[in-house]
Amino acid sequence: QLPPGKPEIFKCRSPNKETFTCWWRPGTDGGLPTNYSLTYHREGETLMHECPDYITGGPNSCHFGKQYTSMWRTYVMMVNATNQMGSSFSDELYVDVTYIVQPDPPLELTVEVKQPEDRKPYLWMKWSPPTLIDLKTGWFTLLYEIRLKPEKAAEWETHFAGQQTEFKILSLHPGQKYLVQVRCKPDHGYWSAWSPATFIQIPSDFIMND
């Protein structure tokens, strides 16, 4: 029977700069029941606070709700593992919410084949930003990326769409069924997961772009 091994805070993520969650990996348990607690202070603060919510983020997590999420403020956090034989502490982790945002995927991806009379046909797609993100405040700039491939192909073709929420693609294989997905990323932060795939059948008479 031994004191617990050193835990590690391995990930912190925020869906929208308004809340965030951190997760830790327990070290070895030393063969005894082990309790974990996360304590933190905001940089410049001399007080320590305990994790406000160990439930919402699942096992080995700490969730910071709106009340506890400050922008432009660094959090300094540490996990303490304790059993009957002693304690061990994780390294301190410095977290700035601005840099841990990972939004939900974009919503409502729609894809259409457009065949204007006077121009070459194209694939037109549009989508909406994730609901948790409020773009009106100006706090957020979301960037988008699209990927598509014929249903049976192995390789994806990727296009960067910048901040726009619609995109045109000209070069497609006639008669093929395509999968299309979109994802987003804040100016600082992580790419979201890809949206669920949307399928589109390209007509056989679709004229390839030169």
Partner: antibody, heavy 121, light 107 residues
Framework: EVQLVESGGGVVRPGGSLRLSCVGS????????MNWVRQGPGKGLEWVSG????????NYAESVKGRFTISRDNARNSLFLQMNSLRAEDTALYYC??????????????WGPGTMVTVSS | EIVLTQSPGTLSLSPGERATLSCRAS???????LAWYRQKPGQTPRLLIY???SRATGIPDRFSGSGSGTDFSLTISRLEPEDFAVFYC????????FGPGTKVDIK
Amino acid sequence: EVQLVESGGGVVRPGGSLRLSCVGSGFSFDDHGMNWVRQGPGKGLEWVSGFNWNGGSTNYAESVKGRFTISRDNARNSLFLQMNSLRAEDTALYYCVRGRSGWFNDAFDVWGPGTMVTVSS
Amino acid sequence: EIVLTQSPGTLSLSPGERATLSCRASQTINSNYLAWYRQKPGQTPRLLIYGTSSRATGIPDRFSGSGSGTDFSLTISRLEPEDFAVFYCQQYAGLPTFGPGTKVDIK
């Protein structure tokens, strides 16, 4: 309208006890850290006690530690201060005060009108 | 405990004049954790400034805060009748503490 209203003050002898209550309205009580601040007659402001919105660890000024106990009931939008072993120097107007955020140690943006506690033999 | 000292103790000025109030801390304070309050006679304190320089909701722009480290100040660009009151600084980097106050009275 956002407001806090204190009650429970009164005159008590040294060594006696009082329980102060504060009820909040017009805002989401459980989104904010809450505090008690006091002001002796003709004196300045002194922070007494506070804790974070979820009723986590309680915090006290050295002058009241071991004698006063803060508690809250978010379901009833209420904050309490149990004051035991009262001394003459505890005589003051006691304010219930809201922190701007979930932390008790924040700027205090809403103040109740106060309830007067007089400790006198 | 972080001790705050305010100066001057009393400031005698006329309406329309500029007032500068000082608050000094016994140790360095991160500027995110300093606030100013005004307390008119017989009334409750009112938050003016938080985070050293951010005006609270509904506070007019004649109030401004500045400073860093151990030295902070509140400036009132043009004194209005309701500004003849007591002003307190407060730190909340640790357990909250208030300065002793500066009284602004009419000259």
